[in-house]
């Protein structure tokens, strides 16, 4: 077996996550990809993937996350802009290939998003926070609504505008036209 | 700990080719991409494209399109670039470059002590 | 294609704090990188992710970011310090910026 492996990344509110999953370009290049979080005990979560098929170099915001496909460079490129302390996780990309398992890229990635100045070696105590804003989204993604075909105990969100409930670990605010579809049965 | 060492001086005729090498030593070649950035002689730095040694797939500037290939050697854990149909502006020192992490693309943390590639007829 | 601005040049007195800027376009949702150059040495990843410095770099060098614009900034300036600075992002490519040549008076 694969041993499973990560990547810490440690940044501070406001800032960006901007992370490449590598994949095998003959072999997924137009293959739906999803970017998603892993809690404890539970199933991992999609909060956003690319359409399907994947198009090449064409961005695909939901919320505050922004996924591009680089059909000829083999990666997905994930950026998460304006970090909040909730975002802290878990988070993984996967390659939708229905009817299998969704194949997962390595390596995983821990974020770690802190409040403020984070006082942890090498990092500088005296830079302004970036509280950059992003406009609001009106990309359609038809994520899977199932992360595996025996993953069934799970219900839809009631409202396609949040994807987060109350004791969520990431907010994803300004989440818009989201259209969530089962693809397995 | 991480090393890039590169190949030493080449003088070119204008039209000639030259290749490049970058070995690598202190971790594991395949994970990390390599990236070739260029300084020609009072200019800044400008970046070349990049290798990904795990599957040889390469991502070039535009403005090297068709005369750069990058390429490797994963028995010997060496990254290639070569640069063909060499013009006089294309003398400069050239760098090769591993990314900081296996999942990012930039920052650029090791680099190799330089190339000074001169075209000169 | 993607550009990042710098001013060609700064000059600061010994001791005392320069500011060198970087700008460009949606630079609020890429991570920055600062590299130091000097003369017949190999560059020197001095910031990245915007403000963090590598090991065994100086804590006079820190870097910062708003909205467009990312500054790397140095206290405390000493001759030593005197190089070539290049902000570096990653947009469908990788870009330097033009360079600051870095004069300490």
């Known amino acids: 077996a694969t041993k499973l492996t990560e990547e810490k990344y440690e940044l501070k509110e406001g800032q960006t996550l901007d992370v490449k999953c590598d994949y095998t370009l003959e072999k997924f290049a137009s293959s739906q990809k999803a970017w998603q979080i892993i809690r404890d005990g539970e199933m991992p979560k999609t909060l956003a993937c690319t359409e399907r098929p994947s198009k090449n170099s064409h961005p695909v915001q939901v919320g505050r996350i922004i996924l591009e496909d680089y059909h000829d460079h083999g990666l997905l490129r994930v950026r998460m802009v304006n970090l909040q302390v909730e975002d802290s996780g878990l988070y993984q990309c996967v390659i939708y290939q229905p009817p299998k398992e969704p194949h997962m890229l390595f390596d995983r990635i821990r974020l770690v998003v802190t409040k403020g100045f984070s006082g942890t070696p090498g990092s500088n105590e005296n830079s302004t926070q970036n509280v950059y804003k992003i406009p609001p989204t009106t990309t359609k993604a038809l994520c899977p609504l199932y992360t595996s075909p025996r993953t069934v105990t799970q219900a839809p969100p009631k409202s396609t505008a949040d994807v987060s409930t109350p004791d969520s670990e990431i907010n994803l605010t300004n989440v818009t036209d989201i259209i969530r579809v089962p693809v397995f049965n | 700990q991480v090393q890039l060492v590169q190949s030493g001086a080449e003088v070119k005729k204008p039209g000639a080719s030259v290749k490049v090498s970058c070995k690598a030593s202190g971790y594991t070649f395949n994970g990390y991409y390599i990236h070739w950035v260029r300084q020609a002689p009072g200019q800044g730095l400008e970046w070349m494209g990049w290798?990904?040694?795990?599957?040889?797939?390469?991502n070039y500037a535009q403005k090297f399109q068709g005369r750069v290939t990058m390429t490797r050697d994963t028995s010997i854990s060496t990254a290639y670039m070569e640069l063909s149909r060499l013009r006089s502006d294309d003398t400069a020192v050239y760098y090769c470059?591993?990314?900081?992490?296996?999942?990012?693309?930039?920052?650029?943390?090791?680099w190799g002590q330089g190339t000074l590639v001169t075209v000169s007829s | 294609s993607y550009e990042l601005t710098q001013p060609p040049s700064v000059s600061v007195s010994p001791g005392q704090t320069a500011s060198i800027t970087c700008s460009g376009d949606?630079?609020?949702?890429?991570?920055v990188s600062w590299y130091q150059l000097k003369p017949g040495q190999s560059p020197v990843l001095v910031i990245y992710?915007?403000?963090k410095r590598p090991s065994g770099i100086p804590e006079r060098f820190s870097g910062s970011k708003s909205g467009n614009t990312a500054t790397l900034t140095i206290s405390g300036t000493q001759a030593m310090d005197e190089a070539d600075y290049y902000c570096?992002?990653?947009?469908?490519?990788?870009?330097f910026g033009g360079g600051t040549k870095l004069t300490v008076l």
């Open positions: 290798l990904n040694p795990n599957s040889g797939g390469a």
């Open positions: 949606k630079l609020g949702e890429r991570q």
């Open positions: 992710q915007d403000n």
């Open positions: 470059a591993r990314d900081q992490r296996k999942t990012t693309v930039t920052p650029f943390e090791y």
């Open positions: 570096q992002a990653w947009d469908r490519n990788v870009v």
